[in-house]
Protein backbone atom coordinates (compact mmCIF):
# COMPACT_ATOMS: atom_id res chain seq x y z
CA UNK A 1 0.00 0.00 0.00
CA UNK A 2 1.83 3.38 -1.20
CA UNK A 3 0.25 5.37 1.41
CA UNK A 4 1.54 9.51 2.67
CA UNK A 5 0.89 9.92 6.49
CA UNK A 6 0.38 14.12 6.80
CA UNK A 7 1.38 16.01 9.31
CA UNK A 8 0.42 19.60 10.67
CA UNK A 9 3.71 20.88 9.24
CA UNK A 10 4.04 18.47 5.98
CA UNK A 11 5.02 20.13 2.72
CA UNK A 12 2.51 17.72 0.73
CA UNK A 13 0.59 20.27 -2.00
CA UNK A 14 -2.38 19.46 -4.03
CA UNK A 15 -4.30 21.87 -6.29
CA UNK A 16 -7.57 19.24 -5.31
CA UNK A 17 -10.65 20.30 -3.27
CA UNK A 18 -9.44 17.30 -0.76
CA UNK A 19 -6.81 14.37 -0.61
CA UNK A 20 -7.41 11.26 0.66
CA UNK A 21 -4.54 9.39 2.84
CA UNK A 22 -5.25 6.11 5.48
CA UNK A 23 -2.04 4.58 7.18
CA UNK A 24 0.15 1.90 5.87
CA UNK A 25 -0.53 -1.29 7.75
CA UNK A 26 1.32 -4.51 8.52
CA UNK A 27 -1.27 -7.55 7.88
CA UNK A 28 -4.64 -7.46 6.58
CA UNK A 29 -7.03 -6.78 9.41
CA UNK A 30 -9.92 -4.49 10.48
CA UNK A 31 -7.18 -1.63 10.32
CA UNK A 32 -7.46 -2.09 6.59
CA UNK A 33 -11.13 -1.37 6.15
CA UNK A 34 -11.25 2.39 4.66
CA UNK A 35 -12.69 5.14 6.64
CA UNK A 36 -15.91 6.43 5.42
CA UNK A 37 -15.23 9.91 3.11
CA UNK A 38 -15.48 13.20 5.50
CA UNK A 39 -17.66 15.88 3.73
CA UNK A 40 -17.22 19.36 5.16
CA UNK A 41 -19.22 22.01 3.81
CA UNK A 42 -19.49 25.92 5.34
CA UNK A 43 -22.52 27.43 5.66
CA UNK A 44 -22.58 30.89 5.14
CA UNK A 45 -19.13 31.38 6.64
CA UNK A 46 -21.11 30.98 10.01
CA UNK A 47 -20.31 27.45 10.97
CA UNK A 48 -19.05 24.27 9.40
CA UNK A 49 -20.22 20.93 9.47
CA UNK A 50 -17.89 17.89 8.41
CA UNK A 51 -20.05 14.76 7.88
CA UNK A 52 -19.46 10.95 7.41
CA UNK A 53 -21.58 7.68 6.82
CA UNK A 54 -21.27 6.28 10.10
CA UNK A 55 -23.64 3.33 8.77
CA UNK A 56 -21.04 2.40 6.28
CA UNK A 57 -18.80 0.95 9.08
CA UNK A 58 -19.32 -3.19 9.71
CA UNK A 59 -20.08 -1.92 13.38
CA UNK A 60 -21.33 0.89 15.26
CA UNK A 61 -18.45 2.84 15.70
CA UNK A 62 -17.28 6.50 17.32
CA UNK A 63 -15.07 7.73 14.72
CA UNK A 64 -12.78 10.56 16.60
CA UNK A 65 -12.36 13.69 14.18
CA UNK A 66 -8.84 15.62 14.38
CA UNK A 67 -7.97 18.92 12.23
CA UNK A 68 -5.46 21.21 11.35
CA UNK A 69 -4.48 24.14 9.01
CA UNK A 70 -1.71 23.25 6.89
CA UNK A 71 1.61 25.78 7.00
CA UNK A 72 -0.72 28.12 9.12
CA UNK A 73 -0.56 29.84 12.28
CA UNK A 74 -3.30 27.41 13.23
CA UNK A 75 -1.33 24.12 12.09
CA UNK A 76 -1.71 22.86 15.79
CA UNK A 77 -3.80 19.80 16.01
CA UNK A 78 -7.77 20.16 17.49
CA UNK A 79 -9.54 17.65 18.46
CA UNK A 80 -13.57 18.04 17.42
CA UNK A 81 -15.23 19.77 20.69
CA UNK A 82 -19.00 19.05 19.39
CA UNK A 83 -19.88 15.73 17.17
CA UNK A 84 -22.61 15.43 15.68
CA UNK A 85 -24.44 11.59 16.03
CA UNK A 86 -26.70 9.31 14.18
CA UNK A 87 -28.49 6.71 16.41
CA UNK A 88 -26.00 7.47 19.06
CA UNK A 89 -22.64 6.94 16.91
CA UNK A 90 -20.27 10.28 15.95
CA UNK A 91 -21.19 10.73 12.52
CA UNK A 92 -19.82 14.31 12.26
CA UNK A 93 -18.00 17.44 13.69
CA UNK A 94 -19.62 20.97 13.46
CA UNK A 95 -16.78 23.92 13.69
CA UNK A 96 -17.65 27.18 15.41
CA UNK A 97 -17.02 30.53 12.75
CA UNK A 98 -13.85 31.63 15.06
CA UNK A 99 -12.17 27.82 14.23
CA UNK A 100 -13.14 28.58 10.41
CA UNK A 101 -10.05 29.68 8.23
CA UNK A 102 -11.44 30.09 4.75
CA UNK A 103 -8.15 30.74 2.96
CA UNK A 104 -5.89 28.21 4.45
CA UNK A 105 -5.80 24.50 3.83
CA UNK A 106 -8.22 22.48 5.60
CA UNK A 107 -6.71 18.94 7.28
CA UNK A 108 -9.07 16.48 8.40
CA UNK A 109 -8.29 13.55 9.82
CA UNK A 110 -10.91 10.78 11.21
CA UNK A 111 -9.35 7.97 12.93
CA UNK A 112 -10.61 4.77 14.90
CA UNK A 113 -10.14 4.68 18.35
CA UNK A 114 -9.93 1.24 18.96
CA UNK A 115 -7.37 0.95 16.28
CA UNK A 116 -5.47 4.14 16.45
CA UNK A 117 -3.52 2.91 12.75
CA UNK A 118 -6.56 3.17 11.36
CA UNK A 119 -7.30 6.30 10.03
CA UNK A 120 -7.54 8.70 7.39
CA UNK A 121 -6.67 12.97 6.46
CA UNK A 122 -7.50 14.28 3.89
CA UNK A 123 -7.45 18.26 2.61
CA UNK A 124 -9.99 20.36 1.90
CA UNK A 125 -10.22 24.21 0.45
CA UNK A 126 -13.12 25.80 2.31
CA UNK A 127 -13.44 28.88 0.15
CA UNK A 128 -14.90 26.09 -2.23
CA UNK A 129 -16.94 24.16 -0.25
CA UNK A 130 -19.21 27.62 1.38
CA UNK A 131 -22.92 27.62 0.80
CA UNK A 132 -24.74 30.86 1.48
CA UNK A 133 -27.77 30.74 3.19
CA UNK A 134 -30.84 31.03 1.02
CA UNK A 135 -31.53 34.63 -0.51
CA UNK A 136 -33.93 37.03 1.53
CA UNK A 137 -36.35 39.68 1.01
CA UNK A 138 -37.24 39.39 -2.91
CA UNK A 139 -39.19 41.86 -4.55
CA UNK A 140 -40.89 43.36 -7.52
CA UNK A 141 -41.27 46.48 -9.20
CA UNK A 142 -42.48 48.12 -12.60
CA UNK A 143 -39.61 49.71 -14.37
CA UNK A 144 -41.96 49.98 -17.31
CA UNK A 145 -45.50 49.18 -18.75
CA UNK A 146 -43.70 45.82 -19.87
CA UNK A 147 -40.70 45.59 -17.45
CA UNK A 148 -40.42 44.06 -14.00
CA UNK A 149 -37.44 44.12 -12.14
CA UNK A 150 -36.01 41.90 -9.27
CA UNK A 151 -34.28 42.56 -6.41
CA UNK A 152 -33.20 40.40 -3.07
CA UNK A 153 -30.81 40.59 0.04
CA UNK A 154 -28.34 38.40 0.72
CA UNK A 155 -26.63 37.83 4.64
CA UNK A 156 -23.23 37.62 3.22
CA UNK A 157 -20.96 39.69 1.41
CA UNK A 158 -22.61 40.83 -2.17
CA UNK A 159 -19.58 40.60 -4.52
CA UNK A 160 -18.94 37.00 -3.37
CA UNK A 161 -21.49 35.16 -4.82
CA UNK A 162 -23.65 34.96 -8.26
CA UNK A 163 -27.12 34.22 -8.70
CA UNK A 164 -29.57 31.76 -10.09
CA UNK A 165 -33.26 33.30 -11.34
CA UNK A 166 -35.17 30.87 -12.13
CA UNK A 167 -39.04 32.06 -13.51
CA UNK A 168 -41.94 31.09 -15.08
CA UNK A 169 -45.99 31.71 -15.57
CA UNK A 170 -49.16 29.63 -14.75
CA UNK A 171 -49.04 28.39 -17.58
CA UNK A 172 -45.50 27.24 -18.26
CA UNK A 173 -44.06 23.35 -17.98
CA UNK A 174 -40.54 24.70 -16.97
CA UNK A 175 -38.83 26.94 -15.06
CA UNK A 176 -36.95 29.64 -17.39
CA UNK A 177 -33.61 30.43 -15.96
CA UNK A 178 -31.15 33.35 -15.89
CA UNK A 179 -27.60 33.81 -14.66
CA UNK A 180 -26.99 36.98 -12.24
CA UNK A 181 -23.88 38.33 -11.22
CA UNK A 182 -22.97 40.12 -7.80
CA UNK A 183 -25.16 42.79 -8.09
CA UNK A 184 -28.29 40.57 -7.25
CA UNK A 185 -30.44 42.41 -9.70
CA UNK A 186 -32.59 40.94 -12.63
CA UNK A 187 -34.83 42.65 -15.67
CA UNK A 188 -37.55 41.03 -17.20
CA UNK A 189 -38.11 42.96 -20.32
CA UNK A 190 -41.80 41.53 -21.51
CA UNK A 191 -44.23 40.83 -18.98
CA UNK A 192 -47.40 39.80 -19.76
CA UNK A 193 -49.88 41.76 -17.42
CA UNK A 194 -52.35 38.61 -18.24
CA UNK A 195 -50.20 35.92 -16.97
CA UNK A 196 -49.49 34.96 -13.02
CA UNK A 197 -45.14 35.09 -12.78
CA UNK A 198 -43.66 32.92 -10.29
CA UNK A 199 -39.77 34.03 -9.10
CA UNK A 200 -37.25 32.30 -6.89
CA UNK A 201 -33.23 32.91 -6.28
CA UNK A 202 -30.94 30.89 -5.40
CA UNK A 203 -27.22 32.09 -4.93
CA UNK A 204 -23.44 30.16 -5.10
CA UNK A 205 -19.84 31.48 -3.40
CA UNK A 206 -18.67 31.83 -6.89
CA UNK A 207 -16.70 33.10 -8.49
CA UNK A 208 -14.50 36.39 -6.99
CA UNK A 209 -13.71 34.58 -2.88
CA UNK A 210 -13.91 31.02 -4.12
CA UNK A 211 -15.14 28.65 -6.43
CA UNK A 212 -17.83 26.53 -4.92
CA UNK A 213 -19.85 24.20 -6.79
CA UNK A 214 -22.52 24.03 -4.55
CA UNK A 215 -25.96 26.36 -4.24
CA UNK A 216 -27.71 27.42 -1.66
CA UNK A 217 -31.48 26.56 -1.12
CA UNK A 218 -34.05 28.49 -3.18
CA UNK A 219 -35.72 31.43 -2.03
CA UNK A 220 -39.46 31.91 -0.61
CA UNK A 221 -40.92 32.19 -4.29
CA UNK A 222 -42.35 35.19 -5.40
CA UNK A 223 -45.43 36.41 -7.38
CA UNK A 224 -46.69 38.28 -9.86
CA UNK A 225 -49.61 39.68 -12.05
CA UNK A 226 -52.68 37.78 -12.43
CA UNK A 227 -53.79 35.03 -11.05
CA UNK A 228 -55.24 33.08 -13.94
CA UNK A 229 -55.00 29.62 -11.78
CA UNK A 230 -58.59 28.42 -12.45
CA UNK A 231 -58.71 28.39 -16.58
CA UNK A 232 -54.56 27.00 -15.79
CA UNK A 233 -54.54 22.92 -17.11
CA UNK A 234 -51.09 22.79 -15.84
CA UNK A 235 -51.14 23.67 -12.72
CA UNK A 236 -51.80 20.86 -10.58
CA UNK A 237 -48.84 19.12 -12.29
CA UNK A 238 -46.74 21.80 -11.85
CA UNK A 239 -47.58 21.88 -7.59
CA UNK A 240 -47.57 18.28 -7.46
CA UNK B 1 -28.68 43.98 3.59
CA UNK B 2 -25.23 44.26 3.13
CA UNK B 3 -24.30 47.89 2.53
CA UNK B 4 -21.35 49.89 2.73
CA UNK B 5 -21.22 53.56 2.84
CA UNK B 6 -18.32 55.78 2.70
CA UNK B 7 -18.43 59.67 3.72
CA UNK B 8 -15.46 61.87 4.38
CA UNK B 9 -13.96 63.12 0.81
CA UNK B 10 -14.13 66.74 -0.16
CA UNK B 11 -11.60 69.14 -1.79
CA UNK B 12 -7.86 70.06 -0.19
CA UNK B 13 -4.71 71.71 -0.67
CA UNK B 14 -1.54 69.77 -0.92
CA UNK B 15 0.18 68.66 2.30
CA UNK B 16 -3.85 68.78 3.85
CA UNK B 17 -5.47 65.60 5.78
CA UNK B 18 -8.57 64.35 5.77
CA UNK B 19 -10.10 61.43 7.31
CA UNK B 20 -12.66 59.19 5.53
CA UNK B 21 -15.30 56.88 7.34
CA UNK B 22 -17.19 53.74 6.10
CA UNK B 23 -20.38 52.27 8.25
CA UNK B 24 -20.90 48.68 7.28
CA UNK B 25 -24.19 46.81 7.80
CA UNK B 26 -25.66 43.95 6.74
CA UNK B 27 -22.58 41.02 7.43
CA UNK B 28 -20.06 40.56 10.50
CA UNK B 29 -17.62 43.14 10.54
CA UNK B 30 -15.12 41.96 13.17
CA UNK B 31 -14.95 38.48 10.89
CA UNK B 32 -13.97 40.59 7.96
CA UNK B 33 -11.07 42.19 6.11
CA UNK B 34 -11.39 45.44 6.10
CA UNK B 35 -9.79 47.96 3.77
CA UNK B 36 -9.78 50.90 1.41
CA UNK B 37 -9.25 50.98 -2.44
CA UNK B 38 -9.10 54.01 -4.98
CA UNK B 39 -10.13 54.82 -8.59
CA UNK B 40 -8.39 57.90 -10.33
CA UNK B 41 -9.88 58.95 -13.57
CA UNK B 42 -9.20 56.88 -16.12
CA UNK B 43 -7.53 54.43 -14.00
CA UNK B 44 -7.48 51.19 -12.45
CA UNK B 45 -8.63 49.86 -9.10
CA UNK B 46 -5.78 50.42 -6.98
CA UNK B 47 -5.88 48.75 -3.11
CA UNK B 48 -4.49 51.57 -0.54
CA UNK B 49 -4.74 49.41 2.56
CA UNK B 50 -6.30 46.19 3.87
CA UNK B 51 -5.99 44.33 7.30
CA UNK B 52 -6.28 41.14 6.97
CA UNK B 53 -5.84 38.24 9.42
CA UNK B 54 -4.46 40.75 12.17
CA UNK B 55 -1.91 42.18 9.76
CA UNK B 56 -2.07 45.69 7.63
CA UNK B 57 -0.79 46.02 4.17
CA UNK B 58 -0.37 49.73 2.43
CA UNK B 59 0.48 50.76 -1.35
CA UNK B 60 3.74 51.62 -1.22
CA UNK B 61 2.92 55.03 -2.83
CA UNK B 62 0.57 55.95 0.81
CA UNK B 63 2.89 54.30 3.60
CA UNK B 64 3.98 56.90 6.19
CA UNK B 65 1.28 59.07 5.29
CA UNK B 66 -2.43 57.00 5.47
CA UNK B 67 -3.47 55.14 8.52
CA UNK B 68 -6.36 52.31 8.84
CA UNK B 69 -8.55 51.83 11.81
CA UNK B 70 -11.74 50.26 12.69
CA UNK B 71 -14.41 50.36 15.55
CA UNK B 72 -15.89 47.32 15.64
CA UNK B 73 -18.57 48.56 18.47
CA UNK B 74 -19.70 51.62 15.55
CA UNK B 75 -19.05 48.97 12.69
CA UNK B 76 -16.76 51.70 10.62
CA UNK B 77 -13.45 51.56 9.28
CA UNK B 78 -11.37 54.79 8.74
CA UNK B 79 -8.70 55.85 6.52
CA UNK B 80 -6.67 58.98 8.24
CA UNK B 81 -4.90 60.78 5.07
CA UNK B 82 -2.34 62.97 5.85
CA UNK B 83 0.10 64.80 3.54
CA UNK B 84 -1.94 64.53 0.80
CA UNK B 85 -0.73 64.81 -2.89
CA UNK B 86 -2.45 65.92 -6.24
CA UNK B 87 -1.88 62.07 -7.18
CA UNK B 88 -4.02 61.21 -4.28
CA UNK B 89 -7.28 62.60 -6.17
CA UNK B 90 -8.99 59.65 -6.79
CA UNK B 91 -12.50 58.22 -5.55
CA UNK B 92 -12.17 55.75 -2.52
CA UNK B 93 -14.06 52.58 -1.95
CA UNK B 94 -14.11 50.90 1.37
CA UNK B 95 -13.60 47.32 0.85
CA UNK B 96 -14.87 44.16 2.55
CA UNK B 97 -13.87 40.59 2.69
CA UNK B 98 -13.93 37.59 3.84
CA UNK B 99 -11.89 37.26 6.80
CA UNK B 100 -8.11 35.94 5.28
CA UNK B 101 -9.14 36.80 1.60
CA UNK B 102 -5.96 39.47 1.20
CA UNK B 103 -3.33 37.61 3.03
CA UNK B 104 -4.31 34.09 1.88
CA UNK B 105 -5.75 34.02 -1.33
CA UNK B 106 -5.76 37.96 -3.08
CA UNK B 107 -7.25 38.44 -6.48
CA UNK B 108 -7.90 41.79 -8.71
CA UNK B 109 -10.81 43.70 -7.27
CA UNK B 110 -13.08 45.97 -9.24
CA UNK B 111 -13.84 49.35 -7.28
CA UNK B 112 -17.34 48.85 -7.85
CA UNK B 113 -17.92 45.96 -6.21
CA UNK B 114 -18.76 47.70 -3.17
CA UNK B 115 -20.23 51.35 -2.40
CA UNK B 116 -20.59 54.48 -4.15
CA UNK B 117 -17.60 55.36 -2.97
CA UNK B 118 -16.26 59.22 -1.66
CA UNK B 119 -14.61 61.73 -3.66
CA UNK B 120 -10.96 63.39 -2.48
CA UNK B 121 -9.41 66.32 -4.50
CA UNK B 122 -5.95 67.39 -3.80
CA UNK B 123 -4.51 70.38 -5.73
CA UNK B 124 -1.53 71.83 -5.98
Known amino acids: LNTTILTPNGNEDTTADFFLTTMPTDSLSVSTLPLPEVQCFVFNVEYMNCTWNSSSEPQPTNLTLHYWYKNSDNDKVQKCSHYLFSEEITSGCQLQKKEIHLYQTFVVQLQDPREPRRQATQMLKLQNLVIPWAPENLTLHKLSESQLELNWNNRFLNHCLEHLVQYRTDWDHSWTEQSVDYRHKFSLPSVDGQKRYTFRVRSRFNPLCGSAQHWSEWSHPIHWGSNTSKENPFLFALEA | QVQLQESGGGSVQAGGSLRLSCTAS????????MGWYRQAPGGECELVTI??????YYADSVKGRFTISQDNAKNTVYLQMNSLKPEDTAVYYC???????????????????WGQGTQVTVSS
Open chain 2, 95 to 113: AAEPRGYYSNYGGRRECNY
Open chain 2, 26 to 33: GFTFDDSD
Open chain 2, 51 to 56: SSDGST
